[in-house]
């Protein structure tokens, strides 16, 4: 498991002649915002595939009004980065669609109205635990510069964050009330499935579903801090060189979720997971019912029959939790066989299976493909006697010698218009959803498919 | 070179039937974004009728006016139909074909013509 | 849905300039899915504005168009004896369904 994370650094014309001046105007302020997709970039699926690593939608940037006369500015962004957290190993090769989109804030009838300025794609090499790499892509006479990474959660390391690292000795090791000591490589083993919320920073398991503390952490997920003793003990300051660290103040300290919420700690910050009932970054929001869309991920809302639970989520397979907002984890039962990479498509289970192996599992053993050729950059496979071509973009048939047909699936969502393009496919939205494949729906109360998505597009226009 | 040529226009009686014909040279729908149908009557301005799309999905497009008399249908990688029914004077016209691009976040840009082929309705 | 186009027809000396108005009873898709054509007696039209204001490709960068949500403007600076034709503004909408509408056309006449 690990995080992908995207920091926008500008957006705005590129250099040239006929670049635009703004994608705002005095007549029409509006404000911008991103979305990213990530897909693993072997994969053999089509370019219509869904954000099988991912998708993530930024905040919206500051109100810009363009000044008329005046030089064309940086336009201003959305803070923070992008973060989209993976579940999986990481891939190593992954493609991204980044979106830029932007909100128009002036007087429209049915709020404000949003609009695709600009799409970027392209395909990457990256490990893992690496430094920031920087990138600069064009769309049309728009250039977009960003930076971006993909690190581990802890406690998965390695360049594809397929290795669980835990420090076997590390409660003997520390003192009480002290943090672990860095794991070193050859206290790394194979993954154990520890009971579901257990903190991967104060607890561990031996055997699967079972949660235990590290000395100076306590409570069933080992979330609760005992004391905050330091490394300078009776015997004198000589245990600070043990290799030990002292805690600061945690994000947890003072337990900063609201109503009942219990606190764990990210590498980052803190994360709260709230009672049925409440939501919010602190658990902070309440009274929700069904009318406030709390399930995500295309669960079914029912209401509650007693006041504290006024609402009921019914999730859609693949996903769990009271909103429905974890994805369940089917990936930790190995079924990939032959060293197949497991992806949880939400729907259904995939695996990527290594050179040499092919079907649903990875179960079978492939011959060389003896030299035969495919055409426009596609790769062979050979099984049971019979070659295949496992085509590149944009190309099918038998040795990928046809033009393929990106738009026959029907890929774009609620009445979207597909259209064959150089990068594969696009789709044009219809008013009131948005994404590469029109699959969210922006509501116009702000509730939406995605907890971060933005409020409605302009509902669309009569046709007379 | 990229070309449009339609087909199959002449004299109908009102009430009548008839299919034009487009045909594409220099490059195949599947790989372009949706082909249309336009009309002008003489003297009059341009009026758009419906669009299918280019790959193999066969999604259409129409206006409200056309639904029900006027059928678009793409018969080959290179040809498209329009056919009309209960055709009366009003649809006496020059009918297009045009291909319909995505640029920029925008559709329906029609950025090749055919040179058009007249429909009288006449008795 | 209707596209209203003024004036029609309009005319105007060689270098001179004209203004034509597009005006939409309501937003285009995305506020900015309009586009013009040139259309000469005997001729199909001719894409030369996308998205409201972008130039399609081989047009002159005197044809200029303008305007966002429901009105817009095509501007023809320093005109060209090979600029009279008819001119229309087509308008792209969603209601169930996506549908394309044209304006009636403004001939433009070149003294």
């Known amino acids: 498991a690990g995080v992908f994370e995207l920091q926008i650094h500008s957006f705005g014309p590129g250099p040239g002649p006929g670049a635009p001046r703004s994608p705002c105007s005095a007549r029409l302020p509006c404000r911008l915002f991103f979305r990213v997709c990530l897909k693993p970039g072997l994969s053999e699926e089509a370019a219509e595939s869904p954000c099988a690593l991912g998708a993530a939608l930024s905040a919206r940037g500051p109100v810009y009004t363009e000044q008329p006369g005046a030089p064309a500015p940086d336009l201003p962004l959305p803070d923070g980065l992008l973060q989209v957290p993976f579940r999986d190993a990481w891939p190593g090769t992954f493609s991204f669609i980044i979106e830029t989109w932007r909100e128009e804030l002036g007087d429209q009838i049915g709020g404000p109205a949003w609009s695709l300025l600009a799409r970027v794609a392209g395909r990457r090499r990256l490990a893992a635990g690496g430094p920031w790499a920087r990138d600069i892509q064009r769309a049309g006479a728009w250039e977009l510069r960003f930076s971006y990474r993909a690190r581990c959660e802890p406690p998965a390391v390695g360049t594809a964050c397929t290795r669980l690292c835990r420090p076997r000795s590390a409660p003997s090791r520390c003192g009480p009330g002290l943090r672990p000591c860095a794991p070193l490589e050859d206290e790394c083993e194979a993954p154990l499935v520890c009971r579901a919320g257990c903190s991967p920073e104060h607890g561990f398991c031996e055997q699967p579903g079972e949660c235990r503390c590290l000395e100076g952490w306590t409570g069933p997920l080992c979330t609760v801090p005992v004391s905050t003793s330091s490394c300078l003990s009776p015997r004198g300051p000589s245990s600070a060189t043990t290799g030990c660290l002292v805690p600061g103040p945690g994000p947890c300290d003072g337990n900063p979720c609201a109503n009942g919420g219990s606190c764990s700690e990210t590498p980052r910050s803190f994360e709260c997971t709230c009672p049925r009932g409440f939501y919010g970054l602190r658990c902070e929001v309440s009274g929700v019912t069904c009318a406030d869309g709390p399930c995500f991920n295309g669960g079914l809302c029912v209401g509650g029959a007693d006041p504290d639970s006024a609402y009921i989520c019914h999730c859609p397979p693949g996903f769990q939790g009271s909103n429905c907002e974890k994805r369940v984890d089917r990936c930790s039962l190995q079924p990939c066989r032959n060293g197949g990479l497991c992806l949880d498509l939400g729907h259904a289970l995939r695996c990527r299976c290594r050179a040499g192996f092919a079907g649903p599992r990875c179960e079978h053993d492939l011959d060389d493909c003896a030299g035969r050729a495919c055409a426009n950059g596609g790769t062979c496979v050979e099984g049971g006697g019979a070659h295949r071509c496992s085509c590149a973009l944009g190309f099918g048939g038998r040795d990928c010698r046809e033009r393929a047909d990106p738009c026959a699936a029907r890929p774009c969502a609620h009445g979207g218009r597909c259209y064959a393009h150089f990068s594969g496919l696009v789709c044009a939205c219809a008013p009131g959803y948005m994404g590469a494949r029109c699959e969210f729906p922006v509501h116009p109360d702000g509730a939406s498919a995605l907890p971060a998505a933005p409020p409605g597009l302009r509902p669309g226009d009569p046709q007379r | 070179q990229e070309q449009l040529v339609e087909s199959g226009g002449g004299l109908v009686q009102p009430e009548g039937s008839l299919t034009l014909t487009c045909t594409a040279s220099?490059?195949?729908?599947?790989?372009?974004?949706?082909m249309c149908w336009v009309r002008q009557a003489p003297g009059k301005g341009l009026e758009w009728i419906a669009c299918i799309s280019g790959g193999s999905s066969g999604d259409t497009d129409y206006a409200n006016w056309a639904k029900g008399r006027f059928s678009i249908s793409k018969t080959s990688s290179t040809t498209v139909t329009l056919q009309m029914t209960s055709l009366t004077v009003a649809d006496t016209a020059t009918y297009f074909c045009a291909r319909d691009v995505y640029i920029d976040s925008t559709i329906f840009n029609f950025n090749l013509w055919g040179p058009g082929t007249l429909v009288t309705v006449s008795s | 849905q209707v596209l209203t186009q003024t004036p029609s027809p309009v005319s105007a000396a060689v270098g001179g300039t004209v203004t034509i108005s597009c005006q939409a009873s309501q937003s285009v898709y995305n506020n900015n899915n309009l586009a013009w054509y040139q259309q000469k007696p005997g001729q199909p039209p001719k894409l030369l504005i996308y998205?409201?204001?972008s130039l399609a490709s081989g047009v002159p960068s005197r044809f200029k168009g303008s305007g966002a949500g429901t009105q817009f403007t095509l501007t023809i600076s320093d005109l060209e004896c090979d600029d009279a034709a008819t001119y229309y503004c087509?308008?792209?909408?969603?209601?169930?369904?996506?549908?394309?509408?044209f304006g009636g056309g403004t001939e433009v006449v070149v003294k």
């Open positions: 087509q308008g792209t909408y969603y209601s169930s369904g996506w549908y394309s509408t």
């Open positions: 998205a409201a204001s």
């Open positions: 220099g490059f195949s729908f599947s790989s372009s974004g949706y």
